[in-house]
């Protein structure tokens, strides 16, 4: 089974690289997850994304969980997911009506 992910190997400033030009086909039977690294810097929020094997992504996300402090300078958050394009933009919250 082949999964698609958003991929930007180098950090993108305030651009979560979730547009169609960043979509890639992951390596069949090897890369079964999408991963995302979000780093908070003084200049803004930096994003890196790629395909990954489940082991690679889980090693990184588990080993570096303590580095994730959203809203804090130099916070680094790693996330892994296994559905197509799941490392894209967060779903917009619906406004209450």
């Amino acid at each position: 089974l082949q999964i698609q992910c958003y991929q930007c190997e180098e950090f993108q400033l305030n651009n979560d690289c979730s547009s169609p030009e960043f979509i890639v086909n992951c390596t069949v039977n090897v890369q079964d997850m999408c991963q995302k690294e979000v780093m908070e810097q003084s200049a803004g929020i930096m994003y890196r994304k790629s395909c990954a094997s489940s082991a690679a992504c889980l090693i990184a996300s588990a080993g570096y969980q303590s580095f994730c402090s959203p809203g804090k300078l130099n916070s680094v958050c790693i996330s892994c997911c296994n559905t197509p394009l799941c490392n894209g933009p967060r779903p917009k919250k619906r406004g209450s009506s």
């Epitope: 950090f11 780093m39 930096m46 990954a52 082991a55 090693i59 570096y64 130099n74 680094v76 790693i78």
Partner: antibody, heavy 120, light 107 residues
Amino acid sequence: EVQLVESGGGLVQPGGSLRLSCAASGFTITNYGIHWVRQAPGKGLEWVGRIYPDSGATYYADSVKGRFTISADTSKNTAYLQMNSLRAEDTAVYYCARKLWISIAGMDYWGQGTLVTVSS
Amino acid sequence: DIQMTQSPSSLSASVGDRVTITCRASQDVSTAVAWYQQKPGKAPKLLIYSASFLYSGVPSRFSGSGSGTDFTLTISSLQPEDFATYYCQHSYATPFTFGQGTKVEIK
């Protein structure tokens, strides 16, 4: 036990080619980036390039771009550095090292290095 | 490319001394900096990752600090086995350049 073992170094004439191997054991290379770093005699460390074996994605330092190629054979758990059009300034000890994809990780395991001498 | 400027290039110190080595990045690299120790004829060894986190098995006399562009490696009380060359490296964006190295010699 995690180990990286380089081999393939030796004496080669300018313009010649050499292929270095980096055999990994104790971990699976598809879970890491494999980086090549070199050190000329009496000089500092120079980052040469890296491969993500799970995708084959590579990146090279400008000094070797177009002449060196990094590849990996995941079935052998081994990475390679193919060096073509070698120059005297490529003379160095070549190390391979592993690093997680995450930016803040360090290169936690290194091979012992293999010496490449480019001379006529 | 991001440059890493390390200083001093060499220093002489005695056992028990406090030693400080600095590294400056040419642009903001957040905390994506590691420090390595290398002894003659040996491969480098990871000491510090993410600018300030001590790698497993490294003695607590080693510490790192900094973020953005300015980073420091400190050895609180130099031991005989610490005489070596130290390198900083960023891994913020390829190429992952190293500093020029600092050789710590016996006074």
